[in-house]
């Protein structure tokens, strides 16, 4: 039965040309966390294995860096960086859960961070 | 290019434990960065994944063989093996040793990309 | 755990033709999916990686597509050594889990 929750940074805002921590947490479940997938939409950005470490999507190698921990910061930001994100968790034994961000890319300097909230 | 090689006895008596030996040559375990796997099929059916570990020692089971079943690594010998307990004729099949994941960092899928040739195993008295 | 399953469990096809093989999972799994061919006495070979990404040294008469619950693997123009067992693999939730198969043989 799964029984954890996916907590993230939520809808959150940063200026164009500047960069961005994308981060989830999962609790309420003592699962073993064996492989966390970024995704935005339908396009993989990164994954990060519990014991073969870090693969970066060749398309994205230049703006993404892992970290910290199993999240991931998103570099020399672009208008077109807005949209969805998504932390993919595969765990042991539990299954998948799945968690959503929102990033919105400013023009201006005006870059507020968002609320967290929750997605079971 | 890394190669596998089972080995271990083709006969098994019910309810004794089956020992499987994969021997990894053309490259270390202990520097790979990959899981190593042992699946198994049945005379005329399909493929079914037993387990992984990592060099580590982290290991992943089937849960319908959990309880029967131990993965082990030996980097000294550049092997790892599998135990299966309490054997029964439905364990009868050849069983395969593979990589999972050797091309992970380039190309960020993981996958059985080696496999051994396999060795038959018959559970019978 | 993830259940896939494959469709047809033989397909009759005459060499030159066309073979489209199906994968079902039981729930998501993206793009995670491989393809792996089987002949008699021999191992699994990697044929697909990642749903669509030939595995190296795979020929070009064989692509994947899909993405999610549903895949496709197709032959475009079958060739005697194609007529095998083919076998579709989700990765990276655990356990692993396979198809059943689907044969490929000479009508």
């Known amino acids: 039965m799964m029984t954890g929750t996916i907590e993230t940074t939520g809808n959150i805002s940063a200026e164009k040309g500047g960069s961005i921590i994308l981060q989830c947490h999962l609790s309420s479940t003592t699962a073993q966390v064996t492989q966390v997938n970024w995704e935005q939409q339908d396009q993989l950005l990164a994954i990060c294995n519990a014991d073969l470490g870090w693969h970066i999507s060749p398309s994205f190698k230049d703006r993404v860096a892992p970290g910290p921990g199993l999240g991931l910061t998103l570099q020399s930001l672009t208008v077109n960086d807005t949209g969805e994100y998504f932390c993919i968790y595969h765990t042991y034994p539990d299954g998948t859960y799945t968690g959503r961000i929102f990033l919105e890319v400013l023009e201006s300097s005006v870059a507020e961070h968002g609320a967290r909230f929750q997605i079971p | 290019q890394v190669q596998l090689q089972e080995s271990g006895p083709g006969l098994v008596k019910p309810s004794e434990t089956l020992s499987l030996t994969c021997t990894v040559s053309g490259g270390s375990i202990s520097s790979g960065s990959y899981y190593l796997a042992w699946i198994r099929q049945p005379p005329g059916k399909g493929l079914e994944w037993i387990g992984s570990?990592?060099?580590?020692?982290?290991?992943y089971y089937n849960p319908s063989l959990e309880s029967r079943v131990t993965i082990s690594v030996d980097t000294s010998k550049n092997q790892f093996s599998l135990k299966l307990s309490s054997v029964t004729a439905a364990d009868t099949a050849v069983y395969y040793c593979?990589?999972?994941?050797?091309?992970?960092?380039?190309?960020?899928?993981?996958?059985?990309?080696?496999w051994g040739q396999g060795t038959m195993v018959t559970v019978s008295s | 755990e993830i259940v896939m399953t494959q469709s047809p469990a033989t397909l009759s096809v005459s060499p030159g033709e066309r073979a489209t093989l199906s994968c079902r999972a039981s729930q998501s799994v993206s793009s995670n999916l491989a393809w792996y061919q089987q002949k008699p006495g021999q191992a699994p070979r990697l044929l697909i990686y990642g749903a669509s990404t030939r595995a190296t040294g795979i020929p070009a008469r064989f692509s994947g597509s899909g993405s999610g619950t549903e895949f496709t693997l197709t032959i475009s123009s079958l060739q005697s050594e194609d007529f095998a067992v083919y076998y579709c693999?989700?990765?990276?939730?655990?356990?692993?889990?396979f198809g059943g198969g689907t044969k490929v043989e000479i009508k």
């Open positions: 593979a990589i999972e994941g050797a091309n992970f960092k380039d190309f960020g899928y993981v996958a059985f990309d080696i």
């Open positions: 693999q989700q990765s990276p939730p655990w356990p692993r889990t």
């Open positions: 570990i990592f060099r580590s020692g982290s290991t």
